[in-house]
Interface confidence: low
């Protein structure tokens, strides 16, 4: 099967001024489709313009497998898919031309990653070791307490990784509550940085020391602070898909399907709000069809479909993956201790895989700089 590499954002090496756009976006469909289809294309373009980031649009257009997944989820007939693609190509050019500093920003965060990765790598390796040690000791936990890697549905990254922040949550706490990062900090389309919230958890037999807990939490929050300071107000320029192509393409595809069905039913589609929705919570058409939430695929599913090593910026996103992912510790009334131990081991392995990807991208960037 032909596939473009995952998360491949093909953006200009410089500002592309070679394509002045004289035609309105809707004109792509003119003369080649029936009027209803043309109107659907316009609706779809409006949706992309207002609700999909430039990065994600480019991903969709530069990655054949992502595009095919989108077309399948949207249930688009071939002629409409072709016309929509042309129109989106046109839209992408316009969006790119609006952001003249894109390339410079990319270089900025690549440089940042090159500088910071060696230290991050060392700390991540340390945390992986700790996770494995904790997994070995998990049998000491009270039978009634397990740790579930329950991910906020709005997160659009791997569903099975207890990352740095996750490692420092409530199982370590003495008092049963801990300030967490806001689950709204997903790496989906919104990627908004908004405050903090708290979470509580019943804790079982205390077998992690307060020192371990404190250490992991502080390290995590320190990293978050670094990244936040570095990115400042421009966070949304960098946090795009960050790995979950599957979720993005299906999510947008289902939104477009809803738009198309609504148009087919001759019902008006609600005007898309200016705020970008989460991919996992697509808008609904007035036809009443609620587009279902996209289920988070497993790590294995994603590793088959999401090829992260192809793109330098992904390295940076994966650092954010490690820093930002918010995992809640959850008290499960059922569940054996052995499952918890296995889960932690799996988490350590997945984190190690992420680190390997980061390391690989670091080498690529290093080689690129040396040339």
């Amino acid at each position: 099967e032909e596939a473009g590499a995952r998360v491949q954002q093909n953006v200009p090496s410089g500002t592309d001024t070679g394509d002045p756009q004289s035609k309105p976006l809707g004109d792509w469909a003119a003369g080649t489709m029936d009027p209803e289809s043309s109107i659907f294309i316009e609706d779809a373009i409006k949706y992309f313009k207002e609700k999909v980031s430039t990065q994600n649009l480019l991903l969709l257009l530069t990655d054949n497998e992502a595009w095919n997944g989108f077309v399948a989820a949207a249930e688009l007939p071939r002629n409409e898919a072709d016309e929509l693609r042309k129109a989106l190509d046109n839209l992408a050019r316009q969006m790119i031309m609006k952001d003249k500093n894109w390339h410079d920003k990319g270089q900025q965060y690549r440089n940042w990653f090159l500088k910071e990765f060696p230290r991050l790598k060392s700390e991540l390796e340390d945390n992986i070791r700790r996770l494995r040690a904790l997994a070995d000791g998990v049998q000491k936990v009270h039978k009634g307490t397990t740790i579930a890697n329950v991910v906020s549905g709005s997160l659009s990254i791997s569903s099975g990784i207890l990352t740095l922040v996750g490692m420092g949550l409530a199982p370590f706490t003495e008092g049963g509550s801990l300030v967490l990062l806001e689950p709204g900090m997903e790496l989906g389309i919104t990627a908004a940085l908004t405050g903090i919230t708290s979470s509580t958890m019943d804790y079982g037999k205390k077998w992690w020391t307060q020192a371990q807990a404190h250490d992991l939490v502080i390290k995590s929050l320190d990293k978050l602070k670094e990244v936040r300071e570095f990115l400042g107000e421009n966070i949304s320029n960098f946090l795009s898909l960050a790995g979950n192509t599957y979720q993005l393409t299906r999510g947008i595809g289902k939104d477009i399907r809803a738009l198309r069905r609504a148009r087919a039913n001759l019902q008006s589609v609600p005007h898309a709000s200016a705020s970008r929705p989460r991919v996992t919570e697509p808008i609904s058409a007035e036809s009443g069809e609620q587009v279902e939430r996209v289920n988070e695929p497993s790590i294995l599913e994603m590793s088959r479909g999401v090829k992260l090593t192809d793109v330098a910026p992904v390295s940076f996103f994966l650092v954010l993956d490690v820093v930002y992912l918010v995992y809640e510790s959850k008290h499960l009334h059922e569940g054996a201790k052995s499952e918890t131990a296995e889960e932690l081991k799996k988490v350590a392995q997945e984190l190690e895989e992420k680190l390997n990807i980061l390391n690989n991208n670091y080498k690529i960037l290093q080689a690129d700089q040396e040339l």
């Epitope: 473009g4 590499a5 995952r6 491949q8 954002q9 093909n10 953006v11 200009p12 090496s13 410089g14 592309d16 070679g18 394509d19 480019l58 257009l61 530069t62 990655d63 693609r85 190509d89 992408a92 050019r93 790119i96 990319g106 090829k307 992260l308 090593t309 192809d310 793109v311 330098a312 910026p313 690989n360 080498k363 690529i364 960037l365 080689a367 690129d368 040396e370 040339l371």
Partner: antibody
Framework: SLEESGGRLVTPGTPLTLTCTVS????????MGWVRQAPGKGLEWIGI?????STHYASWAKGRFTISKTSTTVDLKITSPTTEDTATYFC?????????????????WGQGTLVTVSS | AIEMTQTASPVSAAVGGTVTINCQAS??????LAWYQQKPGQRPKLLIY???TLESGVPSRFKGSGSGTEYTLTISDLECDDAATYYC?????????????FGGGTEVVVK
């Protein structure tokens, strides 16, 4: 370095696999491409295989060629050669950092292997 | 499908002179363009990528420019050794299918 092998005289319709053996290159870090050149003609891009193993082909090459790789080799399978496939086939490594983000450019090339398709 | 079209061959100029080769993409390739030099019986050599970035070891006499669909390779202070065929290549493999990422080639003759 890159070294292509497997080029030979074949009859039309007989599948042929060309192999590019790499040394000193980590294929998990580089995209690799196949380009061909018919005698006296220009370069013709066939396709690429990314560092992670994803493939992308020229529109005319889809179905006619398959690119795959191991840790030390990159293969190009010509599924059903025709006389038009007679050419020197080059294996090429994308420069470090080449991605969809920056574009794929080939800065290391093999010497090429000649495939002749004739009945 | 994206097609790359180059200046017709041959282009000739005297030693010390300047030659300009144009390359046009059928649609925008967002500055993702490379230039290669190939001499008879040899493998291609990357000169410029990203439309204007000089590959390591390539003399600064070679200059690439352009954006969108129009790109140019300029070789100044021509030397005899510059006699070769030059190819442009789209490094952009998205949005549309690629018929051939390479242009047809332009032969440069140095007098």
């Amino acid at each position: 370095s890159l070294e292509e092998s497997g080029g030979r005289l074949v009859t039309p319709g007989t599948p042929l696999t060309l192999t590019c053996t790499v040394s000193g290159i980590d294929l998990s870090s580089y995209a690799m491409g196949w380009v061909r050149q018919a005698p006296g003609k220009g370069l013709e891009w066939i396709g690429i295989i990314s560092s992670s193993g994803s493939t992308h082909y020229a529109s005319w090459a889809k179905g006619r060629f398959t690119i795959s790789k191991t840790s030390t080799t990159v293969d190009l399978k010509i599924t059903s050669p025709t006389t038009e496939d007679t050419a020197t086939y080059f294996c090429a490594r994308a420069r470090a950092g080449s991605t969809y983000y920056t574009g794929y450019y080939f800065n290391l090339w093999g010497q090429g292997t000649l495939v002749t398709v004739s009945s | 499908a994206i097609e790359m079209t180059q200046t017709a061959s041959p282009v000739s100029a005297a030693v010390g002179g300047t030659v300009t080769i144009n390359c046009q993409a059928s649609e925008s390739i967002y500055s993702n363009l490379a230039w290669y030099q190939q001499k008879p019986g040899q493998r291609p050599k990357l000169l410029i990528y990203g439309a204007s970035t000089l590959e390591s070891g390539v003399p600064s006499r070679f200059k690439g420019s352009g954006s969108g669909t129009e790109y140019t390779l300029t070789i100044s202070d021509l030397e005899c050794d510059d006699a070769a065929t030059y190819y442009c290549q789209s490094g952009y493999y998205g949005i549309s299918a690629i018929n051939n990422a390479f242009g047809g080639g332009t032969e440069v003759v140095v007098k």
